[in-house]
Every structure is written in C-alpha cells, then in structure tokens.
C-alpha cells in the first residue's frame, strides 16, 4: 500500500514540477524592470526566453519575439537549451511513469519490469528537475550580473546635462515558478526511486536447507528461486516455512490487492 | 463614436472643494486608462490625474498630491475628479482625456473650466 | 521629473512653406525594451481642445495629414510641416510619455503670414 502511494504520489508530484517548468518556460517574465528607483512607472518592460514585452500604462502591450538564434547571448541559449531538455526528460519519465504505476495493469506485465521503469521515470524526473532549477539558476546569475553591471554604469559618465535612463532588470514571476517546478519534479523523481525499492520481488528469505541426494551434499542457499537452476520444469518449490513467503506459483496465481484493473 | 463630456466646474473659492465629472461614451470606460489635464490660462498644459485600467493604479503630479482624488464609477461610466483644498494656482480648464497608444491622448473631450478666487 | 523644452516659442511662415520645431527633453525618452521613443507631438487650434498628431516620436495618428512628420531620438526630437497650410494656425505641444509626471513643453506657436 505505502509503495503504491509513493508511487502515486511521485508521479502526482512530478506531474505538477512539468507542468511547472513548460509554465515557466513559455512565460515571458523571467526578468523584469527594475522599479525601485522608480515605482510610478509608464512604461513597463518584460523578457522572456522567447520574447520581450514592454507594457504601457494606457494597458498597451507589445511582445517581440527574438527572430534571431546567432544573435542572441550564449547564455540565453544555454538556458533555452536546459529548459527544453528538462521538459523533454519529464515529458518521457511521464509516459514511462504511467506503465510503471502500480495500480495500472498492462498485460502480464511484471513487478521487475514496474520496478526497471518507476527507477528510470524516477531518474528521469530527477534530471529534469536539475535541467530547470539549472536553467533558471544560470538565467539569475546572469540577471545579477547584468543587473550589478547596469548599476555601475548609472553612477558613471552623469557629468554632462542630459540623462539616460538605464533600464535594470530583476527576478521575474518564471524564474520562481521555475526553481518551485524543478523542485518539485526532482522531489517526484526521488519518490519514484524510492518506490522502485518497494516495488522490486524482493529476495524472498529461505532457511538454508541440506539435500541429500546420491551420496553429494548440496547447501541451498537462500535466493537460489530466482534463477531455478537444477529444477526439472515439473518441480513445484515448495514453502519450507509458512513465514508470509509465497512459492513462485502462488506470487504469480493470486493477485495483490493493490492492483486494479 | 468616442465622447467625452466634462461637467462641474465653476468659481470656488481658495480652500474650496470642487468636483468635476467626465461622461463617457461610444466605449467602455473600465477598459482604458483615463487621465485628466489641465490647461492654465497662460496656455501650459500640465497633466494632473490618470487612473490605470481596472482602477487598482491611480497617479498624480506632486502639485496635487493628497489634494485632488482621480476615481471612475463603471456602472455610470463617468469619470470623476474630487479637487480639494483648491489654491489659486488650480485655475485652469480642465480637460479628461483617454489614453492610446504609447501613453499619447488621442481622445479629450472639450474641458470644463475651473476659477479659484477670492 | 523630465523637463520638456521648445523653440522656438512662435514662428510665423508663409503658406506652402517647410516648417521645423525642435522639443529637448532633460531625460532620454527611448525605451530600450521596444527600441521606441516615448514622445508625443499636438495640436491645439485655439478654442479647441487639444488634438494628438504623432507618438512614438514618429508614429502619425489616424487621421492626420501626411505633410505632418516627427522624428528625433533619445533626448532631441523635431516635428516637420512639410508644406504649411493655412488650417495649420496652432500651437504646437510635446509631452514626455515615458515616465510619470507626465509633462508637457511650453508650446510652438505656428502663425501664418
């Protein structure tokens, strides 16, 4: 039961953190005008990855796309590039997710099998979580820089009459939204591994038994099911102990009361 | 077709309050950002109020800060502006006028006039 | 607050004739986020109220007669009458619409001969 909620809820979780980052991804305020010198403001400027926006206050606003790739700073590409890898990751640890749930029956499909995929949906969410808060963390250090950089200038070269007005950016909504989203993919992505521990056909614990056979002693060791060798394929492996362990036959013949059809 | 028709002004006297409206027509007042401008007798043009679309924002010039209150009744769609503690340096035409385009006014209506006077 | 500043204050021409005013603003009226200059040129015949001719420095409105061209960035801007009429007699106004106070400058008054 706990291993089906873990389970749900990773992917719950890392639902929303995509969802999240394609959100942040396509918003168009990673930075915005700084206000603090000036708060009444009537002209209102805004970027994104994809387009700047400049909102006027007679509620006009206009967005202009960036219709150039080599034009643009290598930074803004890198962050472009990371958003959009996160989004694919996640995009694919979902589809991956979904047949992995364990309330989800496809088939005869296997635990290990549930168990390989909630492990790679998991490491996938992970890695798109670090995609976007990367990305994100890469855009605000640049903000921060640029940001510390434009100050500078605003104090230099005032001596003559005339003043230019130095537009500074700071954080925007997406960037928030951003680190919140990878966030919670990567704390999605974490559960799923964690579930996957649950989910695997764990080793199932045998007393060590001595068989006597034809004057040779063989030592059984525990988890030697598995791999069944030495077994005619008639033989039933019989419960040496009643401890909760099922023989293979009874794992296969009953199902849990977890799984929903 | 846009209308804009300023009523309310009159002869006050120094101190006095006064309350100007704007009656809208030909579009939905809520959906613009409206101001109001003045015109002193010496000809100056000086912006005095504006009130940003869905009213949450209204701006002021520090001449008339804490004196004069900008505000819109959608229902009515009219403007209004409350002048208050009115000195003889308020004396002007008084015109409402809604914003386009790049903050220009595109559209005033034809201004009511307002004498602060002993 | 961005002071706003005229020439000349009147100018009296001849019909036909190019006319130029020039309006200096204190402060830098471009935006960088649009690349667009924030500055708005009007026209006030008199008893009228008055009448909106160009913003974005070079953007004509509406309306307005192609003879009218404004241009100019950054701090220096001039509105252009290319060949001035008769129905021109007016005052000329700019107005800074890039930072609150939004302020105005003293007016060109175009007379005609």
């Known amino acids: 039961m706990a291993v089906t909620a873990c389970q749900g809820l990773g992917f719950v979780v890392s639902l929303i953190g995509i969802a999240g980052i394609i959100a942040a991804t396509c918003m168009d305020q990673w930075s915005t005008q700084d206000l603090y010198n000036n708060p009444v403001t009537a002209v209102f400027n805004y970027q994104g990855l994809w387009r700047s926006c400049v909102r006027e206050s007679s509620g006009f606003t206009e967005c202009r796309g960036y219709f150039t790739l080599l034009g643009l700073p290598a930074m803004l590409q890198a962050v472009r590039a990371l958003m959009i890898v996160g989004i694919v990751l996640g995009a694919i640890g979902l589809l991956v997710s979904i047949f992995a749930l364990k309330c989800i029956r496809i088939g005869s499909m296997e635990d290990s099998a549930k168990a390989n995929m909630t492990l790679t949906s998991g490491i996938m969410f992970i890695v798109s979580g670090l995609c976007a808060i990367a990305g994100v963390s890469v855009f605000a250090n640049m903000l921060v820089t640029n940001f510390w950089m434009s100050t500078a200038n605003m104090y230099t070269g005032m001596g003559g009459m005339v003043q230019t007005v130095q537009t500074r950016y700071t954080f925007g909504a997406a960037l928030f939204v951003g680190w919140v989203a990878g966030g919670l993919t990567l704390i999605g992505g974490v559960m799923m591994c964690i579930a996957c521990r649950g989910l695997a056909p764990e080793e199932t614990n045998y007393k060590a038994v001595s068989y006597h056979a034809s004057g040779h002693s063989v030592a059984y060791k525990p988890g030697g099911f598995k791999a069944s060798t030495g077994f005619g394929s008639n033989t039933k492996n019989k419960k040496i102990y009643d401890g909760g362990a099922r023989t293979e036959d009874e794992v296969q013949s009953y199902p849990s009361k977890h799984d929903y059809v | 077709e846009v209308m804009l028709v300023e009523s309310g002004g009159g002869i006050v006297k120094p101190g006095g309050s006064l309350k100007l409206s704007c009656a809208a027509s030909g579009f939905t007042l809520s959906s613009y950002t409206m101001s109001w401008v003045r015109q002193t007798p010496e000809r100056r043009l000086e912006w005095v109020a504006t009130i940003i679309i869905g009213g949450s924002y209204t701006y002021y010039p520090d001449s008339v800060k804490g004196r004069f209150t900008i505000s819109r009744d959608n229902a009515k769609n009219t403007l209004y502006l409350q002048m208050s503690s009115l000195r003889s340096e308020d004396t002007a035409m008084y015109y409402c006028a809604r914003q386009g385009y790049g903050n220009s006014f595109p559209y005033w209506g034809q201004g009511t006039l307002v004498t602060v006077s002993a | 607050d961005i002071v706003m500043t005229q020439s000349p204050s009147s100018l009296t021409v001849t019909a036909g004739e190019k006319v130029t005013m020039s309006c200096k603003s204190s402060?830098?009226?471009?935006?960088?986020?649009?690349?667009?200059?924030?500055l708005t040129w009007y026209q006030q015949k008199p008893g009228q109220p008055p009448k909106l001719l160009i913003y974005w420095a070079s953007t004509r409105e509406s309306g307005v007669p192609d003879r009218f061209t404004g241009s100019g960035s950054g701090t220096d801007f001039t509105l252009t009458i290319s060949s001035v009429q008769a129905e021109d007699l007016a005052v000329y106004y700019c107005?800074?619409?890039?930072?609150?106070?939004?302020?105005f400058g003293s007016g060109t008054k175009l007379e005609i001969k």
């Open positions: 107005q800074n619409d890039y930072s609150y106070p939004f302020t």
């Open positions: 402060q830098s009226l471009l935006n960088s986020g649009n690349q667009k200059n924030y």
